[in-house]
Interface confidence: low
């Protein structure tokens, strides 16, 4: 897939520059398996630069190919608290809205860990809002350095 | 944040092509918690290009965001030795100078596992020195598939 | 190291914007540890720009530094099945062809958890092939979201 | 400062059992791995067993195994070594000793009590 | 089981002169991480043994560092640079490769 005349011809940045590292808000209420997520330089080091936030979950704002990635710490947390119940501690980000494009990106256990982190490659359009589901009774902690969640376009 | 129109013209290299991939030369003495790194091709599939090290820390030579990544695995190691210890084996990365940019960036616990691996994006500055802090009794591994830690400039 | 003055004045496509994620396709026969990879918009959210697969093997077609990752999680899986054997189940990711650049690049062991994820820079050359291999008796979840493999070109 | 008191010893027929007791004292006992070796009278060093920091894991020499037992009471931070079948060449200063952490199969004995003497004679 | 041998058995040495104490196993010692799965106890006279090196050359938390540990594999070495008086004792080596952990027989220094 080569790019377009127009596109070599453009400044660099309108290729896509777009990128956003964010911090945990908060939780959401009991039915609610979301975290919602905050960034700005008044918070720390997290930032967005393209993507915007809308009710704390990430929406993309410009077509491309995105490494997605992600931290989460639980915060109260032994290796016996995650491996306790018949349903481990899960943590999933996945295109949310709009509907029609739903579906899961990344998915990982806690099983008897206390963070999990990875990575991946993904497309993604403008619109998409990205979502990540924490299921179970264990709580994620809000320090910076231990839960994070970012995109950075890659390519068209 | 837009790119200026002088960056926009200059050549491609000038936007930053700075990146690491570094391998572990050492463990500090008794009382100093951090790794100690080594990069070239001499040495395998390490290297500098842009970063530079000061002591067998990172150091920074050009602001932007950059992709900061680490994975360690502890060499002498079973599922019960990493959580023998009322407080786990921790691997810290940080600002660790200037020391008045001092701050963790990135901060995972072994507890019941053997192998550390994350990434996140944050921004650095000309003269940022990162250091990477173990924590604990337990060594890392020298193996250059098991242990390395790198950075890689990703936009201004 | 400095782009030429050819790289330059070359559209920016001929930088290279090499990048591929893949989905498992499925496991090797009895002697054969190496997952057999897929990708392909029909297929779900994977793709291949550049390089190409050789029988489930990915091949580098462009030189350069490439940021390599990869997720992988195990189907049926408890803390106890990955930490009963005296080898733990392990997942490698290294150069098999050329026999005279083959090396282990990546190396993870599953220990007391289902999941592994991981990335690094790693150089590769043009006819580069990267292999997977999972050695130990446990088979890999085939889900999109629990198990890929990806590279991305990020510099010459 | 870290401490290890042994207790127990003393003689014992041929045939039957001793309960060694180990007492920890300045440290997080249930943080640590815990072993027990031996040394007969004028003789060198024999690891005899361990004992993770839970007691999920324990491990026997071939000489003692299916006769000594090891196990552990973390609320009373003490150790223990049950011995049973004694043989006189059981015959020994049973030391415990801190494992430092230092690798998962619990190398490096980084504190040493003082040692309590077993004599198996008729 | 891995056996263990250590030479000299007895090491007669000079206050301030250097000393070297062999320790061989019967297989080896070096794991796939890189590291020697060995370590090295002092026993002073009338006295429990004392933590010196471990992984075959990493000095123990307070030991002296006249005292050193190198070796690979199958064959290592204890040096002391230059002995002291407080030394003198029983010096063992110990493989924790594997279970059962097995040590060597102790090599005796004194002074001459």
């Known amino acids: 897939q080569r790019l377009s005349r127009a596109q070599q011809q453009l400044p660099l940045e309108s290729l896509g520059w777009d990128i956003a590292e964010l911090q945990l808000n908060h939780t959401g209420p009991q039915q609610d398996p979301r975290l919602y997520w905050q960034g700005g330089p008044a918070l720390g080091r997290s930032f967005l630069r393209g993507p915007e936030l809308d009710k704390g979950q990430l929406r993309i704002r410009r077509d491309g190919i995105y490494m997605v990635h992600i931290q989460v710490t639980l915060a109260i947390c032994s290796s016996t608290s995650t491996s306790r119940h018949h349903h481990p501690t899960t943590l999933a980000v996945g295109i949310c809205s709009p509907a029609s494009r739903s579906i899961s990106l990344l998915r990982l256990s806690f099983h008897q860990g206390c963070t999990i982190a990875s990575q991946r490659l993904t497309p993604l359009a403008r619109g998409d809002t990205l979502c990540t589901n924490l299921t179970g009774t264990l709580l994620p902690s809000r320090n910076t350095d231990e839960t994070f969640f970012g995109v950075q376009w890659v390519r068209p | 944040q837009r790119l200026s129109r002088a960056q926009q013209q200059l050549p491609l290299e000038s936007l930053g092509w700075d990146i690491a991939e570094l391998q572990l030369n050492h463990t500090g003495p008794q009382q100093d918690p951090r790794l100690y790194w080594q990069g070239g091709p001499a040495l395998g599939r390490s290297f500098l290009r842009g970063p530079e090290l000061d002591k067998g820390q990172l150091r920074i030579r050009r602001d932007g965001i950059y992709m900061v990544h680490i994975q360690v695995t502890l060499a002498i190691c079973s599922s019960t030795s990493t959580s023998r210890h009322h407080h786990p084996t921790t691997l810290a990365v940080g600002i660790c100078s200037p020391a008045s940019r001092s701050i963790s960036l990135l901060r995972l616990s072994f507890h019941q596992g053997c192998t550390i691996a994350s990434q996140r994006l944050t921004p650095l500055a000309r003269g940022d020195t990162l250091c990477t802090n173990l924590t604990g009794t337990l060594l890392p591994s020298r193996n250059t598939d098991e242990t390395f830690f790198g950075v890689q400039w990703v936009r201004p | 190291q400095r782009l030429s003055r050819a790289q330059q004045q070359l559209p920016l496509e001929s930088l290279g914007w090499d990048i591929a994620e893949l989905q498992l396709n499925h496991t090797g026969p009895q002697q054969d540890p190496r997952l057999y990879w897929q990708g392909g918009p029909a297929l779900g959210r994977s793709f291949l720009r550049g390089p190409e697969l050789d029988k489930g093997q990915l091949r580098i077609r462009r030189d350069g530094i490439y940021m390599v990752h990869i997720q992988v999680t195990l189907a049926i899986c408890s803390s106890t099945s990955t930490s009963r054997h005296h080898h733990p189940t392990t997942l490698a990711v290294g150069i098999c062809s050329p026999a005279s650049r083959s090396i282990s690049l990546l190396r993870l062991s599953f220990h007391q958890g289902c999941t592994i994820a991981s990335q690094r820079l790693t150089p590769l050359a043009r006819g580069d092939t990267l292999c997977t291999n999972l050695t130990g008796t446990l088979l890999p979840s085939r889900n999109t979201d629990e198990t890929f493999f990806g590279v991305q070109w990020v510099r010459p | 400062q870290v401490q290890l008191v042994e207790s127990g010893g003393g003689v014992v027929q041929p045939g039957r059992s001793l309960r060694l007791s180990c007492a920890a004292s300045g440290f997080t006992f249930s943080n640590y791995g815990i072993h027990w070796v031996r040394q007969a009278p004028g003789k060198g060093l024999e690891w005899v067993a361990v004992i993770w920091y839970d007691g999920s894991n324990k491990y026997y020499a071939d000489s003692v195994k299916g006769r000594f037992t090891i196990s552990r009471d973390n609320s009373k931070n003490t150790l223990y070594l049950q011995m049973n079948s004694l043989r006189a060449e059981d015959t020994a200063v049973y030391y415990c000793?801190?494992?430092?952490?230092?690798?998962?199969?619990?190398?490096?004995?980084?504190?040493w009590g003082q040692g309590t003497l077993v004599t198996v004679s008729s | 089981d891995i056996v263990m041998t250590q030479s000299p058995l007895s090491l007669p040495v000079t206050p301030g002169e250097p000393a070297s104490i062999s320790c061989r196993s019967s297989?080896?010692?070096?794991?796939?991480?890189?590291?020697?799965?060995l370590d090295w106890y002092l026993q002073k006279p009338g006295q429990s043994p004392q933590f010196l090196i471990y992984?075959?050359?990493y000095r123990a938390s307070g030991v002296p560092d006249r005292f050193s540990g190198s070796g690979s594999g199958t064959d290592f070495t204890l040096r002391i640079s230059r002995v002291e008086a407080e030394d003198v004792g029983v010096y063992y080596c110990?493989?924790?490769?594997?279970?059962?952990?097995?040590f060597g027989p102790g090599t005796k220094v004194d002074i001459k």
């Open positions: 297989q080896s010692l070096l794991n796939s991480n890189g590291y020697n799965y």
């Open positions: 992984l075959g050359s």
């Open positions: 000793a801190r494992d430092g952490g230092y690798s998962g199969y619990d190398s490096g004995f980084d504190y």
């Open positions: 110990i493989q924790t490769l594997q279970t059962p952990f097995t």
